[in-house]
Amino acid sequence: KFSKQSWGLENEALIVRCPRQGKPSYTVDWYYSQTNKSIPTQERNRVFASGQLLKFLPAAVADSGIYTCIVRSPTFNRTGYANVTIYKKQSDCNVPDYLMYSTVSGSEKNSKIYCPTIDLYNWTAPLEWFKNCQALQGSRYRAHKSFLVIDNVMTEDAGDYTCKFIHNENGANYSVTATRSFTVKDEQGFSLFPVIGAPAQNEIKEVEIGKNANLTCSACFGKGTQFLAAVLWQLNGTKITDFGEPRIQQEEGQNQSFSNGLACLDMVLRIADVKEEDLLLQYDCLALNLHGLRRHTVRLSRKNPIDHHS
């Protein structure tokens, strides 16, 4: 709880925000968790704390570890944890998966690729953009503020895009790079009001207390790649990410499949170590697109162990 993964490359700037929500202007103390050593606030240090931000200028592989931040108030301190990993620079062009930020999708009508984490940095335009390590050139590519716009997107534009910018701290410049995948969606086809294939409406799923359980929300939205379509789970009307129960997680990313030419998505809800109180929750499978939203509700019931007779 209150933990966040952050990563960067050695000799680049890395800035991490305290995962625990506070408000601007509150005192935030940072510690290196393994030693409980306080992180200094003086900017002359290579690693220093600046309010809600922890700055590695530049980062070193040895900086990897868990950092604790405490948002201070006289009546209620709030603690968060930043799990920081600094990697060695790769000699080849390949960007490993562990350095990739979330994938974004684009289409002919919408082809913005945002540079991840850039809002944490003090940077000035223009951004430099690379695709598969090659600098992007030509009038089709426009670096605008913190994102890249590609005109007349084609299937060949799919790939890994890296943004590179300079962070300035008290007159000193530090390089930062961030990479994410871009996929191109086919505009042809049509979309329908979502059809949920599973679970059935008001389905009762039997689970065993103490065991793990999976619920799959699966829906189809039309033919071809869909501009806006999503399936997700809610608990008692609240998003899984906001519900705050670490045992209950949605599978990261949505699996896309084409069933009889239809575009379908599924999202798996994983419940670890099922507890009695999980049986009291309402599990909603939501499927939504531009046409609207459809909801199927599932409840859990206890599965009685089967008697084994000879």
């Epitope: 929500q21 506070g22 201070r72 609240t238």
Partner: antibody, heavy 117, light 111 residues
Framework: QVQLQESGPGLVKPSQTLSLTCTVS?????????WNWIRQPPGKGLEWIGY???????TYNPSLKSRVTISRDTSKNQFSLKLSSVTAADTAVYYC??????????WGQGTLVTVSS | DIVLTQSPASLAVSPGQRATITCRAS??????????MHWYQQKPGQPPKLLIY???NLESGVPARFSGSGSGTDFTLTINPVEANDAANYYC?????????FGQGTKVEIK
């Protein structure tokens, strides 16, 4: 966006227990924050009653502590107020509110509770 | 308990003018470089709305016409320039220790 909604009886008899519930949407009460009850007698100022934080820990105003219980139902994403042995002085608009840190950031619309026989 | 005393109890201001409300605490609400004083606006029939936190920080979405200042025991909320829809009750609140307490309120009327 966090949204809060108070509910409960609008009329309570003297010496009985006042019970109110605050339903939270848009955020899980176990994720973070402190979840407060505040009251405001008609035409008067605000009085902080107490809170329950995301972990279930409670803190009460000492002036009401002997009569107050704040609890929660995580399965319904609700927290509740019970105030025992009420008198006419407990007539007020009761608000629930959330605290990110220190200040009351989001408020419910409030519900008027009248103590009368 | 820390007692917060607001003054004046009410004031009438013309649009475009400055309104100043003060809040005095019975003991200091400042520590470790911060002042744990917050200001709220309450219009009739509505819940209070946070305007200023930590004495001088404007809450997100609140117009820059509102500002706060002060430290220790003496704090000020300023509205400049006042607009017609600023007619409301204004409350200060501290969070220096438990219990949190509020001022008795200041009613701002627009002439």
């Amino acid at each position: 966006q966090v949204q809060l909604q108070e509910s409960g009886p609008g009329l309570v008899k003297p010496s009985q227990t006042l019970s109110l519930t605050c339903t939270v949407s848009g955020y899980s009460i176990t994720s973070d924050y402190a979840w407060n009850w505040i009251r405001q007698p008609p035409g008067k100022g605000l009085e902080w009653i107490g809170y329950i934080d995301y972990s279930g820990s409670t803190t009460y105003n000492p002036s009401l502590k002997s009569r107050v219980t704040i609890s929660r139902d995580t399965s319904k994403n609700q927290f509740s107020l019970k105030l025992s042995s009420v008198t006419a002085a407990d007539t007020a608009v009761y608000y629930c509110a959330s605290t990110v840190i220190d200040s009351m950031d989001y408020w419910g619309q409030g519900t008027l509770v009248t103590v009368s026989s | 308990d820390i007692v917060l005393t607001q003054s004046p109890a009410s004031l009438a201001v013309s649009p475009g003018q400055r309104a100043t409300i003060t809040c005095r605490a019975s003991k200091s609400v400042s520590t470790s470089g911060h002042s744990y004083m917050h200001w709220y606006q309450q219009k009739p029939g509505q819940p209070p709305k946070l305007l200023i936190y930590l004495a001088s920080n404007l809450e997100s979405g609140v117009p820059a016409r509102f500002s706060g200042s002060g430290s220790g025991t003496d704090f000020t909320l300023t509205i400049n320039p006042v607009e017609a829809n600023d007619a409301a009750n204004y409350y200060c609140q501290h969070s220096r220790e438990f219990p949190f307490t509020f001022g008795q309120g200041t009613k701002v009327e627009i002439k």
